[in-house]
């Protein structure tokens, strides 16, 4: 028997520095977690103690903090090289800055293989990119070899900016021939490493003949055996065992997100490459693990540029951006409109001639808007200003919901109206009319939504049975502010870009902004 230790991360989302327990900015260092310096300490400790170790990343290193905004992926290559990752799968967010934003900072600089079997380059891009990532890589480990085959969510064209010259194929269809290739090369220990979410990870384990282990990402799934060490609630045991169609027991793992945990899986193979046993657990990277001094020093050196960036002008406003709770928790506010417009703009993807865009709607809890921006400071807007408006380090995500769920969400928005509560929704691509004289749960009297399958966008009444795409904060997707119906009834959820980054990019693009209050949210006469 031969034992392999798989260390794995996924959805790190530019958390290079240690964070608080909820993966936001570290405030009290003695209670902070994660970060590459701490990760390096644990990885090195395991490498010294165990003979056959692989360090793998299942994608979405890109996007999530000011680190990515400023360094645009160079920080990912630099620190992943420093940690000596053995392989990485491409995630959807690796395409956020287009293909060029992947090629130059990461693909050309990484000293480890970057993998995806289901992304096929065509046209002029083929010669430029296809040698820079691979479908699989055979890695010598100790006296054996292990094949790693990569995959990426086929939804990436709807979630990011891969352009028109990359085709995202079905994961299972694309993986099978690559695994077969590895089999022709007599590689009999094969790990599928990828970024399509836990449901697809399980399907790959079930359907792709020859895959021994699946290491996944995208869905931020937390698996744990025993008593979990922090706030995350396990979605199942670690590893999650799937019985494949050909009768094998295939371990599937994921390690939550944001570098808070290091996945730790021990696999025992027999001499024919069959998995005999698998066990492990994610390791919580808390303050009991010291930060490596040399990596920490490097982080501090890179940090300097971030502090300078925070105070630079992104663009100008010529109007007061009303982000006060007195406005945004009671009525349509222009800060809410600005943020929603930025959220939609960030999700412009012309992937189908029938649609002007794949999504037209935005909802945003008014309680998530934490500050106004005064235009009387020469109109200047900085990252620092936006960090006061959106201080929680969240993301603006894409969900699919039935019309009936949206209707419930808008009823919840005003179910206790008047108490300055955070659930009051700001909107984009939606016209809503409330009648507050009616009883809670029956106050939405009109709800029109902007069409997507149209050449000239116009507002049509919401259909209860239709499925709609909506951009919203991850806080709402996770049922925050009492929006349990969203969490319980959503049909799909893909995590998006960092909230501040979305708004800052929009402001930089527009240069000068003047959002208005324009009748997106109305109250019927006599009720307000």
């Amino acid at each position: 028997a031969w034992e392999l230790t798989i260390l794995h991360t996924n959805d790190v989302h530019s958390r290079l520095e240690q964070t608080s327990e909820d993966s936001s900015k570290c405030v009290n260092a003695s209670r902070c977690m994660g970060g590459v310096a701490r990760l390096f300490t644990k990885v090195q400790q395991i490498r010294r103690a165990e003979p056959n170790v692989l360090l793998l990343d299942a994608g979405d290193q890109y996007q999530g903090t000011i680190w990515f905004t400023v360094y645009k992926g160079a920080e990912v290559a630099h620190f992943m090289n420093a940690l000596r990752y053995d392989a990485m799968a491409l995630g959807n967010h690796e395409f956020d800055n287009g293909v060029e934003g992947l090629i130059e900072p990461l693909l050309k600089e990484a000293k480890f293989p970057i993998l995806s079997a289901n992304i096929k380059a065509k046209g002029p891009l083929a010669s430029q990119i296809s040698g820079l990532y691979l479908p699989y890589k055979v890695l010598p480990v100790g006296d054996e070899v292990v094949g790693i085959v990569g995959y990426t969510s086929k939804e990436t064209p709807f979630l990011s900016n891969p352009g028109t010259n990359l085709v995202f194929e079905d994961e299972i269809t694309a993986l099978q021939p690559e695994v077969d290739k590895l089999k022709t090369l007599n590689v009999n220990k094969i790990i599928a490493l990828g970024h399509s979410g836990f449901e697809m990870d399980k399907l790959i384990a079930q359907k792709v003949r020859g895959v021994d282990v699946v290491v996944g990402g995208h869905s931020n799934t937390f698996l744990y055996t025993g008593n979990p060490p922090s706030k995350e609630v396990p979605a199942g045991k670690y590893p999650f065992i799937v019985t494949s169609d050909d009768g094998r027991k295939v371990p599937v793992v994921q390690a939550y997100a944001f570098g808070k945990y290091l996945g730790y899986l021990k696999i025992e193979f027999d001499e024919r490459g069959n998995v005999i046993s698998s066990h492990g657990n994610p390791i919580l990277l808390n303050s009991s693990i010291p930060e490596d001094p040399s990596i920490k020093a490097d982080i501090n050196k890179w940090r300097i540029k971030l502090d300078n960036y925070s105070t630079q002008e992104l663009g100008k406003t010529i109007v007061y951006l009303d982000g006060s709770s007195q406005s945004c928790r009671f009525r349509e506010c222009n800060m809410g409109n600005l943020i929603c417009d930025a959220m939609i703009n960030n999700n412009l993807r012309h992937t189908d001639e029938m649609f002007w865009n794949h999504v037209s709607m935005c909802i945003l809890n008014g309680g998530g808007i934490r500050s106004p921006i005064d235009e009387r400071n020469n109109g200047t807007i900085t990252w620092e200003n936006l960090a006061a408006v959106l201080p929680f380090g969240g993301t603006f995500d894409l969900v699919q919901l039935k019309g009936s769920t949206l209707k419930k969400a808008f009823e919840h928005s005003v179910h206790r109206y008047g108490q300055s509560t955070g659930e009051f929704l700001q909107v984009g691509g939606i016209h809503v009319v409330y009648d507050l004289s009616r009883k809670p749960g029956d106050r939405v009297v009109k709800l029109d939504v902007l069409c997507t399958k149209c050449r000239v966008p116009s507002y049509d009444p919401l259909k209860m049975d239709e499925v709609y795409k909506v951009i919203l904060p991850n806080f709402l997707a996770n049922g925050g502010d009492g929006f349990q119906m969203i969490k319980d009834e959503l049909l799909r959820h893909d995590s998006g870009d960092q909230d501040i980054n979305v708004v800052s990019t929009y402001i930089s693009k527009m240069k000068v902004i003047y959002p208005a209050v324009e009748g997106r949210i109305k109250f019927s006469t006599g009720s307000h």
């Epitope: 040698g131 820079l132 479908p135 006296d143 070899v145 590895l182 090369l185 007599n186 001499e271």
Partner: antibody, heavy 117, light 107 residues
Framework: DIQLQESGPGLVKPSQSLSLTCSVT?????????WNWIRQFPGNKLEWMGY???????NYNPSLKNRISITRDTSKNQFFLKLNSVTPEDTATYYC??????????WGQGTLVTVSA | DIQMTQSPASLSASVGETVTITCRAS??????LAWYQQKQGKSLQLLVD???NLGEGVPSRFSGSGSGTQFYLKINSLQPEDFGVYYC?????????FGGGTKLELK
Amino acid sequence: DIQLQESGPGLVKPSQSLSLTCSVTGYSITSRYYWNWIRQFPGNKLEWMGYITYDDNNNYNPSLKNRISITRDTSKNQFFLKLNSVTPEDTATYYCARGGWDPFLYWGQGTLVTVSA
Amino acid sequence: DIQMTQSPASLSASVGETVTITCRASDNIYSYLAWYQQKQGKSLQLLVDSAKNLGEGVPSRFSGSGSGTQFYLKINSLQPEDFGVYYCQHYYGTPFTFGGGTKLELK
């Protein structure tokens, strides 16, 4: 330093079997890599014949499948080629090499085998 | 099987010149491609792996490029020791196949 050395008869009669030995020094053939036979015909054309892996599995070129066998003796750190039913078309310089899923980094110096009556 | 086609079959050049050899694969092989040099009466020496990575001790005047189905080996400022036969080879699954070779001769 890793070295590979081919040995065997330089002349084989048609219809007989060709047998060659590759002796490896500086690296154990049970460690990690694949151990290949490659031949080069008089016109310089190269053909990969097959390999034996560190864990004793074989992979042969389909064009030779019914005639070829690659085995090993781990105690001597050697691996062997046997090619049955040879014809004059099998006249070539035979090389052993280390590689497999990656390119052939280490080669023997080659041994010329002529198939002739 | 994946066929590897090399061009030109032979090439005459002078010391100091720059030459490029092309290798075409019959199917997409990503960057699972190697280049070798063979001198008269000797075995092959690995020059480039993964289409572009120079082997250890290989002079920087050699460079590999390309991916998918089209690959190139470029030799800048030819030196007397560069003359010989060059081969490409894919290792994207088995059977591994070689190009027919390009004989680089002194003009």
